[in-house]
């Protein structure tokens, strides 16, 4: 069966029907490049006016305008708010009332696209494997990133969160139109990784999405992540304004000027320092969501009532922090280089600015306890990675899981740890799962490109797709069309249950209280330390003044991860697509 032309609020669209075998039978309808909104520079998105005739939705549209990896040029375009749909079809009748999974990509709120990295037309975020294996509809889309998506003056003149509003427009479009493609508009799951995972979290917290989202999955990121909210957007807006020659004293005049500035100039006015700086790299990412009093009306920690009826899966990779550790402490990955106590202390103090000297010392002490018994370089390097993983991913995710569970009415809560080791040959032998390593398995790459993977990789991918799509169907990762290797029990506040995802998932993979000692340290010991104000404004700009100076944080909550690798059109597959 195949859909043919589908009528949407914008008009008719026609995709392509791809047979899954030469013998006919099952197939997938694929629609690429359906417009879901339009947007002017630094303005909220608006409904697309539509078209006449039948739109041929057969090619991915360009990504939203963003800097290239070298940060000396741009690619993509401003006209970028398009979405893509994969609809699995059986032999006879066209599908109807299927669960819908809407993907939000990561990229530090700075880069990325709905189709993901591409190698020889093999796109990372190709929804075909998830759709056909899980019998769900998959939707991916573009949203604005970087200054064009998140620049804010912190007031009504440039409220920011344009990229988040783009995401909302896509979700709302799906709600209004997906029935025509055979989807169930009352069963929408949003899922994403890193900045996409934090976006998923923010969308569930925003009052704008009331009634739109049934379930959510956050992979390595949360609204509570210290890199997910910018607390001092005006500083960064002024930095950009100065670079492009706009006035900075009056936010109204600054906003008016920025809106008529060449968008490419705005994009290139911000440069991310990727060489080691005085502070952790995540401090230097400026253009991220803000608490605007509207779309995000309050600090995310105060918005969990809004998730009371949204089922949630949240988890991290066991070495999510590795990517950032390699930038902050480059010796981590170099066998011939050593990590020193001083290196680690500098990293710790950079992440604990808000609590000053006492915070840095207490944190350093607990993380280096094992160094007395085992002062090996391997242990010290693993500590650096564990610390970055905890601060940037684990602790915010654990707090969010507890908040979700505590506020749940009908909602169910599930937690996981992805531990299937990275396949990067250049990594140390002790390496676990790096940031973004989970993506290739969720999107079924071991099946789509089997020659590049081992049977154990296919086992991981099969299990993840089964759990993810069962959850989208029923709100329970164990119940649905796909058999799973073991029962995944819900998260409880008492036991902190989580599923450890490895190549062999058994009943022993259900574990409890992940890194409990460190969670208690951050939630209790560190939390009660007095916040200091004196030495927080000492962040110095990068040496090259073409790179944007970091914002003096008013607390330690505005750090954001940084991409060391490109997710550009020609990135190798499988690629590490960060954040």
């Amino acid at each position: 069966a195949k859909l043919g032309a589908v009528y949407t609020e914008g008009g008719f669209v026609e995709g392509v029907n791809k047979k899954l075998s030469l013998l006919g039978g099952d197939s997938v309808d694929i629609f690429k490049g359906i417009p879901f909104a339009t947007a002017k520079t630094l303005e909220n998105p608006q409904r697309h006016p539509g078209w006449q005739g039948t739109l041929k939705a057969t090619n991915f549209k360009k990504r939203c305008l963003q800097a290239t990896i070298t940060q000396d040029n741009t690619y993509g375009q401003e006209d970028c708010l398009y979405l893509n749909i994969w609809v699995p079809q059986g032999r006879k009748q066209v599908s109807h009332n299927l669960p819908v999974m809407v993907w939000i990509y990561g990229g530090a709120f700075l880069m990325g696209s709905g189709q993901g990295a591409n190698f020889l037309k093999n796109y990372l975020y190709d929804g075909e494997e998830i759709a056909t294996r899980g019998n769900v509809i998959v939707v991916t889309f573009n949203y604005r990133v970087g200054p064009l998506g998140f620049l804010s003056t912190g007031d009504a003149n440039l409220p920011g969160n344009f990229g988040l509003r783009d995401q909302h427009m896509a979700i709302a479009w799906v709600k209004r139109n997906i029935a025509a493609f055979g989807g169930d508009p009352d069963n929408i799951t949003i899922f994403g990784e890193s900045a996409g995972a934090a976006s998923v979290s923010l969308q569930t917290l925003s009052p704008y999405n009331k009634g739109l989202i049934r379930r959510a999955i956050s992979q390595s990121g949360m609204a509570l992540s210290p890199w997910a909210i910018q607390k001092n957007p005006l500083f960064w807006a002024k930095t950009i304004a100065k670079k492009v020659g706009c006035p900075t004293e009056d936010t109204g005049k600054m906003a008016a000027c920025l809106k008529i500035t060449d968008p490419r100039a705005l994009t290139l006015a911000y440069k991310l320092p990727v060489k080691k700086q005085e502070y952790p790299v995540v401090h230097y990412l400026a253009f991220i969501p803000v608490i605007d009093g509207d779309f995000i009306p309050d600090d995310p920690i105060n918005l969990y009532n809004n998730t009371a009826d949204i089922d949630y899966i949240a988890g991290i990779n066991n070495m999510d922090g590795h990517l950032f550790a390699t930038i902050d402490v480059p010796a981590v990955d170099k066998t011939k280089q050593t990590v020193t106590e001083e290196d680690f202390y500098r990293l710790v103090s950079g992440h604990t600015v808000a609590k000053g000297l006492k915070g840095a010392q207490a944190t350093f002490d607990i993380y280096t306890e094992s160094w007395a018994q085992d002062p090996s370089q391997e242990n010290m390097k693993k500590t650096v990675v564990a610390f970055e993983t905890d601060v940037l991913f684990l602790i915010p995710t654990e707090i969010a899981l507890a908040q979700h569970k505590a506020h749940a009415k009908s909602a169910k809560t599930y937690s996981y740890l992805f531990s299937h080791p990275s396949r990067m040959p250049i990594y140390p032998k002790w390496m676990g799962a790096d940031h973004a390593d989970d993506l290739q398995y969720v999107f079924g790459k071991p099946f789509a490109t089997p020659l590049g993977y081992r049977p154990q990789d296919r086992a991981v991918s099969k299990a993840m797709i089964a759990y993810w799509t069962n959850f989208a169907r029923s709100g329970d990762p164990n119940m649905g069309n796909s058999p799973v290797p073991t029962h995944w029990y819900p998260y409880t506040l008492e036991n902190g249950n989580y599923l450890d995802i490895t190549k062999t998932i058994t009943s022993a993979s259900m574990k409890e209280h992940l890194r409990e000692k460190f969670l208690k340290f951050w939630a209790v010991t560190f939390e009660v330390l007095p916040t200091v104000t004196g030495d927080q404004d000492t962040l110095t700009p990068p040496e090259d003044d073409s790179e944007v100076a970091p914002d003096p944080p008013s607390d330690d909550s505005q750090v954001v991860p940084v991409p060391p690798t490109d997710d550009s059109v020609e990135a190798q597959m499988p690629a590490t697509i960060g954040f």
Epitope: G4, G11, P49, Q52, T54, A172, R176, G211
Partner: antibody
């Protein structure tokens, strides 16, 4: 100017079919979608479906799926709506209506065709 | 399907009055359209995209709203304005409100 002229009133028996025509003029026929909307006596408006006269693509609301067929004849700039297995509750005025612009509201309407279903 | 709730279902007013008709959508929608229909006639487009007036529609008609709540306002009723008014949302399956009959008081 845009004009949509519909065929005349029809009286049908239950179980029969009816085919209503809508002839368009004053614009490029294949450039705008044509919708069909019906209104039962003393009732509100009900959208039935839409046809793209350019390629003949159609979409029908769930309620009429399997009973309604919309076609077009580009040589005469006419669209047709056929409703089968008529029942008494199908008694209504049937309107064709053209998009105003883009995917927009229904900006131009035919005069309506009364279809009466009675035994 | 998107549900449309129009209120009031009927309304009595006098020439010169200011009249407001509301339409609530569930879930939220992007844009709302409004139509006027007189007895025995086809509907006529009055407001599109929540607040835009097609050419030929008098400026006493205005529309506002976003998300779930939309309003049609007639600033000063004229004799020819007594009719039935319908709101309509545009999704993959467009739906109309049940109508508001505006009568002379």
């Amino acid at each position: 100017q845009v004009q949509l002229v519909q065929s005349g009133a029809e009286v049908k028996k239950p179980g029969a079919s009816v085919k209503v025509s809508c002839k368009a003029s004053g614009y490029t026929f294949t450039s705008y979608n044509m919708h069909w909307v019906r209104q039962a006596p003393g009732q509100g408006l009900e959208w039935m479906g839409v046809i793209n006269p350019g390629d003949g693509a159609t979409s029908y609301t769930q309620k009429f799926q399997g009973r309604v067929t919309m076609t077009r004849d580009t040589s005469t700039s006419t669209v047709y709506m056929e409703l089968s297995s008529l029942r008494s509750e199908d008694t209504a005025v049937y309107y064709c209506a053209r998009d105003y612009y883009g995917s927009s509201p229904l900006g131009y309407w035919g005069q309506g065709t009364l279809v009466t279903v009675s035994s | 399907d998107i549900q449309m709730t129009q209120s009031p279902s009927s309304l009595s007013a006098s020439v010169g009055d200011r009249v407001t008709i509301t339409c609530r959508a569930s879930p939220s929608i992007s844009y709302m359209n409004w139509y006027q229909q007189k007895p025995g006639k086809a509907p006529k487009l009055l407001i599109y995209a929540a607040s835009s007036l097609p050419s030929g529609v008098p400026s006493r008609f205005s529309g506002s709203g976003s998300g779930t709540d939309f309003t049609l306002t007639i600033s000063s009723l004229q004799p020819e304005d007594f009719a039935t008014y319908y709101c309509q949302q545009r999704s993959s399956s467009p739906t109309f409100g049940q109508g508001t009959k505006l009568e002379i008081k």
